[in-house]
């Protein structure tokens, strides 16, 4: 950056090189060039010469003043016009930054995705700071008082093998940057209470012709958790409102859920599960599309595939969709 140049003088910023966005700031330039009494001192921001708000303080020093500075980053340098010198002489340069102190981190959430071997902790960092902001995640055992700290710039994955202080912990997040430091409330967790079962996936659908046609949705999960509660939501693609069905599920076999749907309509399905009685849900599964037949029986399956409708009696395809849903982050 500009801070690496060889200087023939000094440039400094008041109140500081990193300051709160919207502040009034002063940039000072002091020349120390051999055999040069500067005729004029010039300031450049991002390579463009500044023309206003420059005050000469004395023979070697000038000040550039900015009101309500709003740029997150700028490269400043200053030059001198020396007698008998054809070009301006570089004095020095500095990178400056403006931003905000961190907000108090809130909505601290820690979950263990089954089979991941990690505890994943996330939080709401608040408003954008524009400057380098680091987060320290504190994990303190309620049983041994031992505390681990993890430095990160966003979320954190903590190996469950490193959590050797029992099952109960406090977790909190400290946010810090050049303009301030804040700390979240403490979240109390029990490792057994924050496990999210292995993802539930809708594999196929079929509509069976009967007196009243019914659609069967086939879905499964690789979870080893015994007591699992699930929700399946569905709607016509033209609708805004979801219908939700609840299930207490045992995943020793593929689940089959029955729906009585309107004919000749394209529906979308999603499923999510949680360990029964626990706090956190899986994110909703990928969108799974199924179009009910007009009257003829059809076997169909579609998760974000292109339409493959035949004029024949049956249309069959395997669910391959892995596009994330509109509610991917909904774990609470």
């Amino acid at each position: 950056g500009i801070t690496n140049i060889n200087c023939s003088g000094h440039i400094w910023v008041e109140p500081a090189t990193i300051f709160k966005m919207g502040m009034n700031i002063s940039i000072y330039c002091q020349a120390a060039i051999k055999n040069c009494q500067p005729r004029k001192l010039h300031f450049y921001k991002n390579g463009i010469k500044e023309r206003f708000q420059i005050t000469r303080i004395n023979k070697t020093t000038a000040r550039l003043w900015y009101k309500n500075f709003l740029e997150p980053h700028a490269s400043m340098y200053c030059t001198a016009e020396c007698p008998k010198h054809f070009q301006e002489t570089l004095i020095c340069g500095k990178d400056i930054s403006s931003g905000y102190p961190p907000d108090i981190p809130d909505e601290v959430t820690c979950v263990i995705y089954e089979y991941s071997g990690n505890m994943t902790c996330t939080w709401n960092a608040g408003k954008l700071t524009y400057i380098d902001t680091k987060y320290v995640v504190h994990v303190k055992s309620l049983e041994t008082e031992e505390e681990q700290q993890y430095l990160t710039s966003s979320y954190i994955n903590i190996s469950t093998d490193s959590l050797q202080g029992g099952k109960k912990y406090l977790v909190w997040v400290q946010a810090a940057n050049a303009l301030g430091m804040e700390e979240s409330k403490q979240l109390q967790i029990h490792l057994d209470d924050i496990v999210i079962p292995s993802a539930a996936v809708i594999s196929r659908a079929e509509t069976i012709n009967a007196t009243v046609p019914k659609t069967i949705i086939y879905w499964d999960s690789q979870t080893t958790i015994e007591k699992v509660s699930c929700e399946m939501r569905y709607k016509a693609t033209t609708n805004q409102t979801w219908n939700v069905k609840e299930f207490d599920t045992n995943f020793t076999y593929v689940q089959q859920s029955e729906f009585y749907l309107e004919p000749n309509i394209k529906y979308v399905f999603q499923v999510r599960c949680q360990e029964t009685g626990k706090r956190y849900w899986q994110p909703w599964s990928s969108l799974f599309f199924h179009k009910t037949p007009e009257t003829v029986p059809q076997v169909t399956s579609k998760a974000f595939q292109h339409d493959t409708w035949n004029s024949g009696l049956t249309v069959a395809s395997i669910s391959t969709g892995h596009l994330t849903s509109d509610n991917r982050g909904d774990i609470g």
């Epitope: 320290v136 504190h138 303190k140 309620l142 041994t144 008082e145 031992e146 505390e147 681990q148 700290q149 993890y150 430095l151 406090l170 909190w172 400290q174 430091m181 804040e182 700390e183 403490q186």
Partner: antibody
Framework: QVQLVQSGAEVKKPGSSVKVSCKAS?????????MCWVRQAPGQGLEWMGC?????????YYANWAKGRVTITADESTSTAYMELSSLRSEDTAVYYC????????????WGQGTLVTVSS | DIQMTQSPSSLSASVGDRVTITCQAS??????LAWYQQKPGKAPKLLIY???KLAAGVPSRFSGSGSGTDFTLTISSLQPEDFATYYC??????????????FGTGTKVTVL
């Protein structure tokens, strides 16, 4: 068994700075630990000054009153922690202790012998 | 800012007496509380940690109880060597930017 050995007594002028050292033996420097500093003015109670956390990264924490005046550092190569207090005034006359449990808990099983710092003009 | 309020500030008792000292935190500190004994000219000595766990080498006449905000140190039968000043200390977290002191103000136990 952790042992903490502090530097000797100091007499300082108001406005100057003092740096007290605390050499630790018996701490596993590969593990996470807190090293903290506590002071006690003559006839007064214990006053927490701050701590340094040493682990995969280093973090320092200071009492509200100590911010800007106290700097705590650790030199892992010599197993020594330091506490520097600047802008000394007469009310900083106290015995200064380093304290730790040799791990990442905040209660203190082990204390240094104390360093008397006298601030006088 | 978590504040630690210790009471009484001093008490007089006789050998064999049961002595109780209380410490109150201004917010929930779970069981993260320690008790220390200090004698004149000496560094403090850890008696109790995690509110109720006895530190190594501490006689069983010392006990601690409480969680959340209210804590108690009890000496079941005061011995001559127990005349000293006792301090509580919150050991929950020191990362909070607004902490002033983590110790209580102290309780001086003197001979009646």
């Amino acid at each position: 068994q952790v042992q903490l050995v502090q530097s000797g007594a100091e007499v300082k002028k108001p406005g100057s700075s003092v740096k007290v050292s605390c050499k630790a033996s018996g701490i596993d420097f590969n593990s996470n630990y807190y090293m903290c500093w506590v002071r006690q003015a003559p006839g007064q109670g214990l006053e927490w000054m701050g701590c340094i956390y040493v682990g995969s990264h280093v973090n320092t924490y200071y009492a509200n009153w100590a911010k800007g005046r106290v700097t705590i550092t650790a030199d892992e190569s010599t197993s020594t922690a330091y506490m520097e207090l600047s802008s000394l005034r007469s009310e900083d006359t106290a015995v200064y202790y380093c304290a730790t449990s040799g791990s990442s808990v905040l209660y203190f099983k082990f204390w240094g012998q104390g360093t008397l710092v006298t601030v006088s003009s | 800012d978590i504040q630690m309020t210790q009471s009484p500030s001093s008490l007089s008792a006789s050998v064999g007496d049961r002595v109780t000292i209380t410490c109150q935190a201004s917010e929930n500190i779970y069981s993260f509380l320690a008790w220390y004994q200090q004698k004149p000219g000496k560094a403090p000595k850890l008696l109790i940690y995690s509110a109720s766990k006895l530190a190594a080498g501490v006689p069983s006449r010392f006990s601690g109880s409480g969680s959340g905000t209210d804590f108690t140190l009890t000496i079941s039968s005061l011995q001559p060597e127990d005349f000293a000043t006792y301090y509580c200390q919150q050991t929950n977290r020191y990362s909070n930017p607004d902490i002033y002191n983590v110790f209580g103000t102290g309780t001086k136990v003197t001979v009646l």
